[in-house]
Each structure stands twice: as structure tokens, then as C-alpha cells.
Amino acid sequence: ERDCRVSSFRVKENFDKARFSGTWYAMAKKDPEGLFLQDNIVAEFSVDETGQMSATAKGRVRLLNNWDVCADMVGTFTDTEDPAKFKMKYWGVASFLQKGNDDHWIVDTDYDTYAVQYSCRLLNLDGTCADSYSFVFSRDPNGLPPEAQKIVRQRQEELCLARQYRLIVHNGYCDGRSERNLL
């Protein structure tokens, strides 16, 4: 019987922010409740001279009025006692985009090909997650090697999120576009 309490989930041991920096393409995602990036999601992680990690991300968002915009998002990460668990503050470059604070866990990565990210926004009384999101990232926009695909599926099962992900298309929709020149 799988333990689905969030406190039992394993994360990447000895996570290295510097090795994680660079471009990651989101290949699959499990959505939370509400507004969220839809597709064409590309994130760029970096670490400054003080060791703080930050990220910018671009992706297509469908607003409540059914407008599609390419959103530019920014996030800063505060370290915790676990090197793979961060407190993330995020906001959209445009004022109408979402902002907030989430946990941001790096569940697993090999730094060179794949990464699995997880965030639980709301806990149930029994310690399981009531509202979560998760991304599968690849260094290559064409996808993941078969062995990486398998370990990713295993991690999805360990997060109690098997079969809850959907693939993310990368069709160039946001290449050279942003919300500033679409509205």
C-alpha cells in the first residue's frame, strides 16, 4: 500500500542548484485548481553569487475570457533545511497574471536529461494533498530517453499522481511572443 502523505515523499538527495541551472522544457504536467500555464512552457533557472536560485518561465495561458496569452513569469526561491525543498514566490510580468507563494520541491533530477518537480498547495487532514501540481522537465525539447521516461513514471507513482499528467506541446506558439504584444 502506497503512502500518499506528503511528508513521506522523497526528494532529490544533495540537490545541487548550480547543476540544475539552465533551460528546462516542460514535457508533462499535473494541474492544480484554477488558472495555470497550458503549454509551450520553458523555464530558465539560475543561481546568483549569493547562492539564491531564481527562475523565469514562459508559457501559454488561457485567461478567463478565453484569450490566449504568452505569459512571462518570474520566481524566486528561498532555501529550507532540505536542499531540494524551496519556498517559491512567483509573479507574472504583466499585472493581470497570477502571483503567489508555493512550496517547490525537486523530487528527482539527473541534471542533464530529466527533472520532476512537485508542489502541494493544500493538505488534507490526513496529510495527503488536496491541491497539487507537478511538472516533468526535459533538457531536450524533443523529449526524454526511454530510461528517463521510466524513472519519471516511477516518481509519478511515488507522488500518488500516476495517470494524472498530460503531455505538453511545444509548437512554437510563444516563440517571440509575450503578453505585452498580444493584448
Epitope: D110, D112, S138, D140, N142, L144, E147, K150, I151, Q154
Partner: antibody
Framework: QVQLQQPGAELVRPGTSVKLSCKAS????????MNWVKQRPDQGLEWIGR????????HYTQYFRDKAMLTVDKSSSTAYMQLSSLTSEDSAVYYC??????????????WGQGTSVTVSS | DIVLTQSPASLAVSLGQRATVSCRAS??????????MHWYRQKPGQPPKLLIY???NLESGIPVRFTGSGSGTDFTLTINPVEADDVATYYC?????????FGGGTKLEIK
């Protein structure tokens, strides 16, 4: 530290079977594949097949599909290879070797010391 | 199956000099942004030991005298400078597709 423990030697009769073991320690067994590699005296390395420690998915090279059967026991973190219908051609050293995506190598990063199988009447 | 052809089959190099081993694949072993070619060293009576993974990445604990290069179908292992401890047989191996395959090996001796 990662270790793959194999028995040193097996002496078996022609026409019989032998089951080789490879006990893993020092890592999460279900995160990796176990490969098996054959080496005849003064010869090169020949890949037999691999098995996923998580769900027992297997891949074999064509010749060994009828010769070798790979299994795992997750509870003891042990991989097994059964070789059947043994002939003198099966006399060799058999290595187990770990591989996987977790650390990004996609190569066989740890090897057992090998089991020397001698087929003789 | 992907056939890996190593050359030369054997070579003799003076201490302190450079040794170069070549491995050619019958088809590309490059996919998803990486070349899935690896190099191993085997000394007599011992199991193989990983030296280089994914064409050019030095395995932890391996001296920087060992370098791997190449992509697609043509790969090279270079040892510079060669030391007495390097006497061994060197193998390339691909993991781009099943069945995994090894090259025939290159035996390095000291001149």
C-alpha cells in the same frame, strides 16, 4: 557504498541449468536496471540482457532469449539469471552490472566481481 | 543491432605518450541531445570499470588523463599521458538502443 555481490564459481553438468545471483546493496534497487554480461576466456564482453528492478521489464539480445531468464527479488535486492541447456559454449565469467537514468550516466557504472561458470561432465 | 568497431585491436605506447582508441558505430547513438556511448577499462582478472559516460563525461574518481570525445557514430578515447597502470583492455559500449552492444576491445601495452 554500492556493491554487487556474486558467487565466485559454479561447476555444472552439460544439459542442466544454473541460476546465478547478484545481491545489490548501497543503493535503491528499484531505481536501476541490472545488466548481465558474458565474457569467455580471453574474449570480449557480450551483453546478455537487462531487467528493471522496479517492474521486472526485460530486454535480451536475440541469442539469449532462449538461453537466459532474468528475474529479480525486490525484497532482497537480488537479481538472478538462469541459464538453461548448458553446453561448453556457456563456460564463461558472467557479470552483473547496474545501469539507469537516475544519476544521468545511462551506462554500467557498478559491476559485480563475476561468477565463473564451468560446464563439464 | 548497432555494431561497434574498435580500432586498433591492440596498441603499444611509450610511458608519458598519448594513446588514442577509436570506436565507430554502425548507426548513430545520438538522441535526445546526448550521445549514449561509454568507455570501460578492464584489467586481467577484474570486472570492467566505467571511465567515460555519454561520450565525454569523466566518471567520478577517474583521472583527468582520460578524455572522451565524438558524437553520432565516431568516438575517441584518449589517454594522455599514459602510465604503467593503464595496461588493460578498453571497451566502448552503446546504450542508445537495445540490445546494448560492446566494441571488440583494444588492448593497450607499454612500449
Amino acid at each position: 557504498q554500492v556493491q554487487l555481490q556474486q558467487p565466485g564459481a559454479e561447476l555444472v553438468r552439460p544439459g542442466t541449468s544454473v541460476k546465478l545471483s547478484c545481491k545489490a546493496s548501497g543503493y535503491r534497487f528499484t531505481d536501476y536496471w541490472m545488466n548481465w554480461v558474458k565474457q569467455r576466456p580471453d574474449q570480449g564482453l557480450e551483453w546478455i540482457g537487462r531487467i528493471d528492478g522496479y517492474d521486472s521489464e526485460t530486454h535480451y539480445t536475440q541469442y539469449f532469449r532462449d538461453k537466459a531468464m532474468l528475474t529479480v527479488d525486490k525484497s532482497s535486492s537480488t537479481a538472478y539469471m538462469q541459464l538453461s541447456s548448458l553446453t561448453s559454449e556457456d563456460s564463461a565469467v558472467y557479470y552483473c552490472a547496474r545501469s539507469g537514468a537516475v544519476e544521468g550516466r545511462y551506462s554500467m557504472d557498478y559491476w559485480g566481481q563475476g561468477t565463473s561458470v564451468t560446464v563439464s561432465s | 543491432d548497432i555494431v561497434l568497431t574498435q580500432s586498433p585491436a591492440s596498441l603499444a605506447v611509450s610511458l608519458g605518450q598519448r594513446a588514442t582508441v577509436s570506436c565507430r558505430a554502425s548507426e548513430s547513438v545520438h538522441s535526445y541531445g546526448h550521445s549514449f556511448m561509454h568507455w570501460y577499462r578492464q584489467k586481467p582478472g577484474q570486472p570492467p570499470k566505467l571511465l567515460i559516460y555519454r561520450a565525454s563525461n569523466l566518471e567520478s574518481g577517474i583521472p583527468v588523463r582520460f578524455t572522451g570525445s565524438g558524437s553520432g557514430t565516431d568516438f575517441t578515447l584518449t589517454i594522455n599521458p599514459v602510465e604503467a597502470d593503464d595496461v588493460a583492455t578498453y571497451y566502448c559500449q552503446q546504450s542508445n538502443e537495445d540490445p546494448r552492444t560492446f566494441g571488440g576491445g583494444t588492448k593497450l601495452e607499454i612500449k
